[in-house]
Interface confidence: medium
């Protein structure tokens, strides 16, 4: 049977600058905690991504919101404990 | 009002190795086409991502599928034309 081709409009709509879920390393957001381990070691955050149809424009957040997550902090030689860490999410994105 | 905290189980579930939409530059998938421009310049593909709860394990694709998309190929001094490009998507992911 013929290959199903994703039409241009759909390709464009999905590729254009928007807030998409991305898995981000906890320590990249909390570099001061680099000597500790977290479980999970990455978290799902909304991040602006995509292309703008003009190479002089970039997909950037124009609105952000905080989200607080419960993680396990694992200190060597110490019992793991639940901690609450706050991360910044991208809510609205624009090509600028 | 109190901050709403995403509970550990949900954080873990969302962070664990899975296929997530990612916007990928067309020329990174088709490096031989680097002298041409495409519109859009990136496409949305499912890619394995996430953490495995063990730093010796990696989130890898164990099943892939092709997807064919219609894009505009822009050659300098030539009129843009629709082309169909095939990309590999990650269908199933595992920690290995």
């Amino acid at each position: 049977s013929e290959v199903e081709v994703v039409p241009f409009q759909e390709v464009w709509g999905r590729s254009y600058c928007r807030a998409l879920e991305r898995l981000v390393d906890v320590v990249s957001e909390y570099p001061s905690e680099v000597e500790h381990m977290f479980s999970p070691s990455c978290v799902s955050l909304l991040r602006c991504t995509g292309c703008c149809g003009d190479e002089n424009l970039h997909c950037v957040p124009v609105e952000t919101a905080n989200v607080t997550m419960q993680l396990l902090k694992i200190r060597s030689g110490d019992r793991p404990s639940y901690v609450e860490l706050t991360f910044s999410q991208h809510v609205r994105c624009e090509c600028r | 009002s109190e901050v709403e905290v995403v509970p550990f189980q949900e954080v873990w579930g969302r962070s664990y190795c899975r296929a997530l939409e990612r916007l990928v530059d067309v020329v990174s998938e088709y490096p031989s086409e680097v002298e041409h421009m495409f519109s859009p310049s990136c496409v949305s593909l499912l890619r394995c991502t996430g953490c495995c709860g063990d730093e010796n394990l990696h989130c890898v694709p164990v099943e892939t599928a092709n997807v064919t998309m219609q894009l505009l190929k822009i050659r300098s001094g030539d009129r843009p034309s629709y082309v169909e490009l095939t990309f590999s998507q990650h269908v199933r992911c595992e920690c290995r």
């Epitope: 013929e2 199903e4 039409p7 254009y16 600058c17 998409l20 909304l46 | 997530l20 939409e21």
Partner: antibody, heavy 122, light 112 residues
Framework: QVHLQQSGAELMKPGASVKISCKAT????????IEWVKQRPGHGLEWIGE????????NFNEKFKDKATLTADPSSNTAYIQVSSLTSEDSAVYYC???????????????WGQGTTLAVSS | DVVMTQTPLSLPVSPGDQASISCRSS???????????LHWYLQKPGQSPKLLIY???NRFSGVPDRVSGSGSGTDFTLKISRVEAEDLGVYFC?????????FGGGTKLEIK
């Protein structure tokens, strides 16, 4: 599991605007289009338009272009339709639905909200 | 817009019988990519529509194999073998080959 929860019934006056919400759970909100469909007795189901959450991408049925505004907030996994300049013709049940888009093979509406009844009356 | 015409408007059947619903489109539903985007939905009384069949003949998850779809071009059929009480409701065909997507007027399946 995928679930779309819509806001409650509305009784509005002619000329006013109404905003109906559709909260999505159980899947990656930004990866699927949200469709809006109108149903009124004797007129069957009519597609209003669609939005890809988190993006500026939306498509409309020409008939509803000046009537409906579609928005989505990825941080709360909620899509909205605002219907403006209300008349009795806008009295209907409004459904949100999740659509695969052509991307996953066919633009069919695989999960639907429970519907929101809008009554317009003076 | 593509007009979708369903027949019959009402279909009274006895439990255990076979029901057949026809759907005709005003133009071909074969997409330029070779696929046919014709789908069937069921709306039970007081509920929202639910997807039954997508792309002519593919059963959506959880749909029993008593329900089947067939057809091509402009003529399509939904068949329900061994009708049960839970099958009653309004069946809609829908196309998404052309923009805007459009729906048939519905066929009401009633138990005799």
């Amino acid at each position: 599991q995928v679930h779309l929860q819509q806001s409650g019934a509305e009784l509005m006056k002619p000329g006013a605007s109404v905003k109906i919400s559709c909260k999505a759970t159980g899947y990656t909100f930004s990866s699927y289009w949200i469709e809006w469909v109108k149903q009124r007795p004797g007129h069957g189901l009519e597609w209003i338009g669609e939005i890809l959450p988190g993006s500026v991408s939306n498509n409309f049925n020409e008939k509803f272009k000046d009537k409906a505004t579609l928005t989505a907030d990825p941080s709360s996994n909620t899509a909205y339709i605002q219907v403006s300049s209300l008349t009795s013709e806008d009295s209907a049940v409004y459904y949100c639905a999740r659509s695969t888009g052509f991307y996953y093979g066919g633009n069919y509406f695989d999960h639907w909200g429970q519907g929101t009844t809008l009554a317009v009356s003076s | 817009d593509v007009v979708m015409t369903q027949t019959p408007l009402s279909l009274p059947v006895s439990p255990g019988d076979q029901a057949s619903i026809s759907c005709r489109s005003s133009q071909s539903l074969v997409h330029s990519n070779g696929h046919t985007y014709l789908h069937w939905y069921l709306q039970k009384p007081g509920q929202s529509p639910k997807l039954l069949i997508y792309k002519v003949s593919n059963r959506f998850s959880g749909v029993p194999d008593r329900v089947s779809g067939s057809g091509s071009g402009t003529d399509f059929t939904l068949k329900i073998s061994r009708v049960e009480a839970e099958d009653l409701g309004v069946y809609f065909c829908s196309q998404s080959t052309h923009v805007p997507p459009t729906f048939g007027g519905g066929t009401k399946l009633e138990i005799k």
